[in-house]
Each structure stands twice: as C-alpha cells, then as structure tokens.
C-alpha cells in the first residue's frame, strides 16, 4: 500500500498585488486522519496561514469543498495578495492526536508577488537657481517587486545622462524603492521646460510611470535693466523709462532714485510674457526739469525675486 | 459501491475468528476501513480502523485481542481470545471519521461466542 | 476516552412532527465538530446522516440537520416522515485516532 503523498503541482506562483493567490495542493489519500494545514515559510518560525481543523483566517478559502466527503484537494485561495505576503508555502497533513502531528509535508510553492511602483515624485532644489548653474532633481518610486526596473531622465523629451540611481534594499526583500539623482544645467529658456523622470517596470504593461518637475519652479531669469531719455513731452517735463527685461519669477519691486533719493516705488504688475516665459516690464517717471538747478542722477534699482538690488542709471542734463 | 463481509459464525469462548470485508466499486488503497460490533438488541460500538500498515487503531477495550489489516480490495478482522460477550453482529465501514466518516457499510456477519 | 450520552433514549412522534435529539459530549470533541449522526433500521446496517456536526450527507434528505458545537449536539428532522421511524446514533471523536465512541441511541417510534 502507498503510504499518503502530499502534491504541491506549482514550484512557484507569480501574483500581482490585489488579487487572489492559489495555491495548490492534493493528497493522495483519507489516511491517516487528521488536517491539513498550510504554513509560510518552514522551521520553527513559520507562519500559520490555514488550519482545516480550526481557527479563523478571513484571507483564506478554500478552492473545493474541504467538508465534501472524499475530497483530497486542499488547494487554498489568498485573496488581496500583498508584497508581504511573499514566501514558500507549504501544505502540512496532520495525524488527528492530542496533539496532531506532522505526518508529511509538500515540497512547497514559491509565491512571488507583483506590485506596481508607485507614481514617482520629482522633486528639485530648496532654492531657485540661475541659467549655467547645475542643479540636482530627485525621484523617488517604492513598493514595487520584483527588484528589476528601469528609471529614464528627461528633459523636453531628450534623454539625460547625467545621473545616479539606486535600488534598496540590496538584499531579497518584499518590496523595494528606487532612488535617482539627476543633474541639469539651466539655461535662459529653462522656464518652460519640464524635466521627467520615467520607471519601467514588468506589472506596468510597457506603460511607463512619469513624475515631472517644472523647471519654472527652479529656475531665477534675473532682469536686464536699460534707461533711456524720452523726447521732452512739455517744456519742463522730461520723460525717462526703465525697460526691464527677460525676468523670471515675476516678482520685482523698482525703486527710482533722483541724485540717491528715492522717488519713486513700485510693484511689477501688468507685465508682458516673451515667448520663452520670461517677462517684460516698463516703468517711466516724469521729470520737473525746472525743479533742478544741477544735472540729476536717475537711477532704476530693480530688486528681483528677493536677490540683491541691480541697477541702471541716467545722467539726465540740465541746461542752464 | 459496496462492502460485503463474510466469515462470521460460531466459535467457542477462546476460540479466534478472521472476518473478511470485500470492496467493490472503489479501492481501499486511499480509504481507511473501520470495524463497528452491535451486540443483540444494544448500540454499536467502535472497534477499530485499519488505514496502512502504521496507521491502523483500536479502540481501548479491543486492542490486543483484535488485529485488522488490509489490501486494496479486501480488509480483515483477526478476533482472538473471544468470549461470550463478543457475540454481536459485526459491520465494516469505509472511513476513519472526522471528516472521512462512516459512509459505505457491510450488510453485517453474525459471530456467535457459545460452547 | 470520551463518552456520548444521547437523550432521551426513546421518543414518541407523529408523522410531521419536529424531533430534536441531542448528544451530550464528556469532553469537547476534536476540532469541535467530530460528529457525525447515523440512522439505523432494524435489520440494516447503519446509514451517514450527518458529518462534522452539521454537513448533510450524500443522498440524505434535507429534512435532517446537524446542529452544535465542542460537547452539545443536535440532529433535528424537521417534518418527520414515515420511513423516519429508526434508531439514530451519533458518533463522537475524541483528540485520540482510536477514540470515537457511539452514544447509547435514540429510537423514534410512531406515536
């Protein structure tokens, strides 16, 4: 007579995080009496995952009617499959006693579990920065398994090349993380460029995850300032302007000083876009000629986005 | 799906007795085979399973005196030492209970413990 | 071992009545639930009614249900019909293999 023969059908199993996990196993006998129990993992430490004789285990069902009859099939579903619940499954035949004990043991099935990555998150640096200086962007991506995955950098769609990527952890684990560092140089037309990062991994299909950072976020365009004297609109009245182009973000404040006083100041506002993001802003101030007896120093002082003040100035003439 | 026994009859008090359950319709290879007496006008009561040749119990009462083996179409019930007491009408069962219970019966073989 | 006591040893019933015997377990059975019921005709080999405490048998009309827990058990026919007349059994099983023990019967007789 053949003694009972635990089958285990699946070396492994492959399972995408959230569904359902079946595991298979058959016995080929009713003797000897007694459960079958499912473990995860072996040795001491292994982990109860179904009793057929008791406990509670709401994850679990089992495939066919475990109280039919004859049934020798005590294939077991897992449902909402988590990357932790990785591992090598073993069905167990108990013989009934007090206590039951092991009779024999499945070779075991191997459950890898699937799990997407997460969006990756872009993230670039605390403070802005200027066209020419580098700058560093991060993307971070986790829980994904199994450990292989690809990670892409671009920028307005050009493959960089400049960066650094790791996997954590080293080891086996139930999930990992992906880390990247990417370097960027700014130039002037930066503001409407976007820099991605791209994570290719088997459980998305060959549809990629993208996480973007705009660089408008990062960059600082700092303003070119120009003075120029108007045509004298009335006998006493001269009329200068100050252009200040090419900026970005636009926040600007100018001051105008006549011989280092303040005259006037005022907020960027009503500001006119350049194609490449950046801003154009004219601010005029109205000169009483008559007011001085001395050649007048205008200056425009433009501070932009909270930097140190630059600026422009005019020596306006003052004919005797 | 049926068992029949056979070897049933009389036998004097110290005497032994082999009965036979025969299988037809399935296989004892996968099934335990349970031994259950009823003594006239009482209740059953258990004897014994016979699964392979480590898994095979008797009930406290009955060990020593009964001995059960089995092949794939036939399985036996070796009484020794038998007394009046023995007397009752002796059934098989495919099953080992729990959840392998009692579900094919023998029509039952009488054994009479007289001298 | 274990011992089963059925009660009551015999009743008396009309045909639709509702009959509840019970078994009365020592000690709880294995897993909770290592009972089965049996009916018996005279004459007749034994026949499965009910399996862990409450699975129907093959074949076996749904009229009868198995019911309990741990040490308290019962077989319930819930219209009792004329070939419902017989003795039943219940069998309980204790931690140890060779322990499963019969209760003493209950015989249903028409009233």
């Known amino acids: 007579e053949e003694e009972l023969q635990v089958i285990q059908p699946d070396k492994s199993v492959s399972v995408a995080a959230g569904e359902s996990a079946i595991l298979h196993c058959t016995v080929t006998s009713l003797i000897p009496v007694g459960p079958i129990q499912w473990f995860r993992g072996a040795g001491p430490a292994r982990e109860l995952i179904y009793n057929q004789k008791e406990g509670h285990f709401p994850r679990v069902t089992t495939v066919s009617e475990s109280t039919k009859r004859e049934n020798m099939d005590f294939s077991i579903s897992i449902s909402n499959i988590t990357p932790a619940d990785a591992g090598t499954y073993y069905c167990v035949k108990f013989r009934k006693g007090s206590p039951d004990t092991e009779f024999k043991s499945g070779a075991g099935t191997e459950l890898s579990v699937r799990a997407k990555p997460s969006a990756p998150v872009v993230s670039g640096p605390a403070a802005r920065a200027t066209p020419q200086h580098t700058v560093s962007f991060t993307c971070e991506s986790h829980g994904f398994s199994p450990r292989d995955i690809t990670l892409k950098w671009f920028k307005n769609g050009n493959e960089l090349s400049d960066f650094q990527t790791n996997v954590d952890p080293v080891g086996e684990s139930v999930s990992y993380s992906i880390h990247s560092t990417a370097k960027v140089v700014l130039t002037r037309e930066d503001v409407h460029s976007q820099v991605i990062c791209e994570v290719a991994h088997v459980t998305l299909q060959g549809d990629p995850l993208r996480g973007t950072a705009n660089l408008s976020e990062t960059i600082r365009v700092p303003p070119t300032l120009e003075v120029t004297q108007q045509p004298v609109r009335a006998e006493n009245q001269v009329n200068v302007t100050c252009q200040v182009r090419k900026f970005y973000p636009q926040r600007l404040q100018l001051t105008w000083l006549e011989n280092g006083n303040v005259s006037r100041t005022e907020t960027a506002s009503t500001v006119t876009e350049n194609k490449d993001g950046t801003y154009n802003w004219m601010s005029w101030l109205l000169v009483n000629v008559s007011a001085h007896r001395d050649d007048v120093k205008l200056t425009c002082q433009v501070e932009h986005d909270g930097q140190p003040a630059v600026s422009k100035s005019h020596d306006l003439k003052v004919s005797a | 799906r049926q068992l029949v026994e056979s070897g049933g009859g009389l036998v004097q008090p110290g005497g032994s007795l082999r009965l036979s359950c025969a299988a037809s319709g399935f296989s004892l290879s996968s099934h335990g085979i349970s031994w259950v007496r009823q003594a006239p006008g009482k209740g059953l009561e258990y004897i014994g399973t016979?699964?392979?040749?480590?898994i095979t119990y008797y009930a406290s009462w009955a060990k020593g005196r009964f001995t059960g083996s089995k092949t794939s179409s036939t399985a036996y019930l070796q009484m020794t030492s038998l007394r009046a007491e023995d007397t009752a009408v002796y059934y098989c069962a495919r099953g080992s209970a729990w959840n392998d219970p009692f579900d094919y019966w023998g029509q039952g073989t009488l054994v009479t413990v007289s001298s | 071992d274990i011992e089963m006591t059925q009660s009551p040893s015999s009743v008396s019933a009309s045909v639709g009545d509702r009959v509840t015997l019970t078994c009365q377990a020592s000690?709880?059975?294995?897993?909770?639930?290592?009972l089965a019921w049996y009916q018996q005709k005279p004459g007749q080999a034994p026949k499965l009614l009910i399996y862990l405490a409450s699975t129907l048998a093959t074949g076996v009309p749904s009229r009868f249900s198995g019911s309990g827990s741990g040490t308290d058990f019962t077989l319930t026919i819930s219209s009792l019909q004329p070939e419902d007349f017989a003795t039943y059994y219940c069998l309980g099983g204790g931690d140890d293999e060779a322990d499963n023990v019969f209760g003493g019967g209950t015989k249903v007789e028409i009233k």
């Open positions: 000690q709880s059975v294995y897993g909770n639930n290592d």
């Open positions: 016979i699964g392979t040749g480590v």
